[in-house]
Each structure stands twice: as C-alpha cells, then as structure tokens.
C-alpha cells in the first residue's frame, strides 16, 4: 500500500512539476524591468525565451518574437535547449510511469517490469528536473551579470545633454516557477525510485518449486520472508533488487496590431 | 464615432477651485486612459495626468501633485479634474485626451478655458 | 524628466514643396522589448486641439495622408510633410510616450510661403 502511494505521490508531483516546466518555458517574463528607481513606469519590458514585450501605461501589450536563430545570444539558445530536454525527458518519463503504476493493469505485466520501469520513469524525472534547475539558474546567472554590468555603465553618454538610460532586467515570475517546477520534478523523480525498491519481487524470478525433504514436504513460493528455512539465494532474508539491469525500450504573435491587456 | 466632450468654459478667482468634466462616448470607456494636458494661451502643451476610468489608479506629473486631482465616474462615463488654489499662471484651455497604442493620445476634448483673473 | 528639443521653432515653405521638422529627445525613447521608439507627432490648427498624426516614430494614425512621414530612432526624430498643402499650415508637436511625466516638444510653427 504504501509503495503504491509513493509511486503515485512521485507521478502526481512530478507531473505537476513537468507542467510548471512547460509553463516556464512558455512564459514570457523570465526577465522584468528592474523597477527599484522608478515604479511607475510608461513603457515596462518584459523578455522571454522566445520573445520580448512591452506593457504600455495606455493598457497596451505588444510582443516581438525572436525571428533570428544565429543572432540570438549561446546561453540563451543553451537555456532554450536544456528546458526543451527537461520537458522531453519529462513527458517520455510520464509516459513510461503511467504504465509502470501499480494501481493500472496491463495485461499480465509482472511486478519485475513494473519496477524497471518505476526506476526508468524516476530517473527521467530526476533528469529533467536538474534540466529545468540548470536551465533556469543559467539564466538567472545571465542576468545577474547583465544587471551589474547595466549598473556600471547605467548612463552612458551621447554628447551633450543627450544621454542613453540602459534598461536594467531582473528576475522574471518563469524563474521562480521554473525552479519550483524542476524541484518538483526532481522530488518525484525521487519518490518514484524509492517506490521502485517496494515494487521489485522479493525473491529469485523463478516459478513456485516444490523440494521434497525427508520426512515432510514444503513448497516455497516466491512472496513473503519465510523464516528459518534456508532455502534459495535469499539466505539474509532481504529483498531481492534487480537494478534495473533489464530496461524498457525508450520512446524517444506577431500579434495583432494591439493586444489589449 | 468617439467622441470627448468637455464642460463649458470658467472664470475663477485667484485661490478658488474649479471641476471641469469630460464626458466620453462612442468606446468602452473602462478600457483605455484618459489624459489631461493643459495649454497656456500662446504655448506649447504640458501633460498634467491619466486616469484609468476602471479604477480610481492615476499618473500624476509631478508638477501638478498639489494643483490636480483626477476621478472619474463610470455611471455616466464621465472623467474629472479638480484644479485647487487656483492663480493667474493656471489660465489655459484644458484639453482631455484618450490615451491609445503608443502611449499616444488618440481623441481630444474640444478643450476648456479656465481664466483666473481677479 | 525628458526634454523634446524641436527645431526649427518656424518654418515658412510653398506649396507642393518638402517640410521637415526634427525632435531631439534627452533620452532615449527606444524600448528594448519590442524596439519601438515611443515618440508621437501631433499637429494643431489654431482653436483646435491638437490631432494625432503619428505615433510609434513612423506609424501614421488612421486617416492621416499619407505625405505625412515619421522617421527616426532612439534620440533623434523628424517629420516630413512630402508636398505641403494649404491645410498644413498648423503647429506640430513632437511628445515623448516613453516614461513619465509624458513631455513634448515646444512647437514649430509651419506656414506657406
């Protein structure tokens, strides 16, 4: 019981957890305005990994996707791709965690297979939400730099009274629920692992056998310890734990004229 | 079509109060800001404040923080200024604006003189 | 705050001749995330308000002829009037919608010679 809980308390989680990484990923406030000097703002921009916006004070949104793939900065192509493969690996992970759920019956699938995929799906997980967790802090890192750079050179000079005021960047709502979200993950990945040691046969693989002893006759069953008997491989009376050697096969705008907000 | 109409023209005595209204129609009037700019007779224009006509949330020039007050009233789609202590220096027309992509100011009351002058 | 600079504060040109009018901002107008300069140009015929011609820098408001252009970026703007017509003759005021208190330039007086 307790095993079936943690599985499907590691599926719940980490699918809440791949669903705030799609999230993130779609989201287009990875980066604010820093508004520390000012507030209240006319014009407040906004960036994503996909696109940049502006909020207008009239109540106005208007969005420019990043048409260009070679202009685009390395780290932030290197963000997009780390987030894509968490999301993958996520969505291969549920995939295989949903047929490797106890509660669900599949034909006559063992609790062998059930198991190795268990610590297929775990691990997938655990992958993907390091993915999202990298992803995420590459970014913040990125800005970080970005933000004490902007501040050295905050006003740089055009001549005269004519001066330039760098936008300064901060940290953008996608960040906070990127981590979130590949912590989440993780943690189900986790759960879903641990789940697996409670999932796999408890003795060898081999079917019910029948040893003749002299003097009286017992058949041994792979299931629960049996104490005293000294039969089998399972001498310590522990679980047996296949280390998941056997592994299953691996299923790999521009907007309108005006968005009113 | 959208239209702003503004209330009629006023005398004021130096140190009084004047309310003057803009009254719009022909848009969603909780869907956009409307602008205040004042212009003093032979200037330029001066922005003096927007209003979001949904909410009681204002902008304010600084300049104007202790002259103006901005309200509204979505009942009757009516926005407001309120100019206190009025002096000889606050005579203009005050134009209302409705404020569109841009941050520009797409539609314009047809202006009120406001003359202080004891 | 910004201060829009125009010049020239007056410009006399005959009919069917070319009007170029300049705005130069103190700041920068461009916004980073969607690389728009947030400059409008208004034009005001005496005892109206003033008329919105363009906003965005160069994108012309409904119904504005098209002689009327807007170009530029990040400081420096102009206005051209490709063929004046007698119905120019106005003032034309350059503001800054970029950050607030929203400013605008002090007026050029356009007439025909």
């Known amino acids: 019981m307790a095993v079936t809980a943690c599985q499907g308390l590691g599926f719940v989680v980490s699918l809440i957890g791949i669903a705030g990484i799609i999230a993130a990923t779609c989201m287009d406030q990875w980066s604010t305005q820093d508004l520390y000097n000012n507030p209240v703002t006319a014009v407040f921009n906004y960036q994503g990994l996909w696109r940049s916006c502006v909020r207008e004070s009239s109540g106005f949104t208007e969005c420019r996707g990043y048409f260009t793939l070679l202009g685009l900065p390395a780290m932030l192509q290197a963000v997009r791709a780390l987030m894509i493969v968490g999301i993958v690996l996520g969505a291969i992970g549920l995939l295989v965690s949903i047929f490797a759920l106890k509660c669900i019956r599949i034909g006559s699938m063992e609790d062998s297979a059930k198991a190795n995929m268990t610590l297929t799906s775990g691990i997938m997980f655990i992958v993907s939400g390091l993915c999202a967790i990298a992803g995420v802090s590459v970014f913040a890192n990125m800005l970080v730099t970005n933000f004490w750079m902007s501040t050295a050179n905050m006003y740089t000079g055009m001549g005269g009274m004519v001066q330039t005021v760098q936008t300064r960047y901060t940290f953008g709502a996608a960040l906070f629920v990127g981590w979130v979200a590949g912590g989440l993950t993780l943690i189900g990945g986790v759960m879903m692992c641990i789940a697996c040691r409670g999932l796999a046969p408890e003795e060898t693989n081999y079917k019910a056998v029948s040893y003749h002893a002299s003097g009286h006759s017992v058949a041994y069953k792979p299931g629960g310890f049996k104490a005293s008997t000294g039969f089998g491989s399972n001498t310590k009376n522990k679980k047996i734990y296949d280390g998941g050697a056997r592994t299953e096969d691996e299923v790999q705008s521009y907007p309108s004229k005006h968005d009113y907000v | 079509q959208v239209q702003l109409v503004q209330s009629g023209a006023e005398v004021k005595k130096p140190g009084a109060s004047v309310k003057v209204s803009c009254k719009a129609s022909?848009?969603?009037?909780?869907?956009?800001?409307v602008n205040w700019v004042r212009q003093a007779p032979g200037q330029g224009l001066e922005w003096i404040g927007m209003v979001h006509p949904s909410g009681s949330e204002t902008r304010l020039n600084q300049q104007f923080k202790d002259k103006a007050t901005l309200t509204r009233d979505t009942s009757t789609s009516t926005v407001y200024m309120e100019l206190s202590s009025l002096r000889s220096e606050d005579t203009a027309v005050y134009y209302c604006a409705r404020v569109w992509s841009g941050n520009a100011f797409d539609y314009w009351g047809q202006g009120t003189l406001v003359t202080v002058s004891s | 705050d910004i201060v829009m600079t125009q010049s020239p504060d007056s410009l006399a040109v005959s009919l069917g001749e070319r009007a170029t009018i300049n705005c130069l901002s103190s700041?920068?107008?461009?916004?980073?995330?969607?690389?728009?300069?947030?400059l409008t140009w208004y034009q005001q015929k005496p005892g109206q308000p003033p008329k919105l011609l363009i906003y965005w820098a160069s994108t012309r408001d409904s119904g504005v002829p098209d002689r009327f252009t807007g170009s530029g970026s990040g400081v420096d703007f102009t206005l051209t009037i490709s063929s004046v017509q007698a119905e120019d003759v106005a003032v034309y005021y350059c503001?800054?919608?970029?950050?607030?208190?929203?400013?605008f330039g002090q007026g050029t007086k356009l007439e025909i010679k």
């Open positions: 503001q800054n919608g970029f950050s607030f208190p929203f400013t």
């Open positions: 700041q920068s107008l461009l916004a980073s995330g969607n690389q728009r300069n947030y």
């Open positions: 022909g848009y969603s009037f909780t869907n956009y800001w």
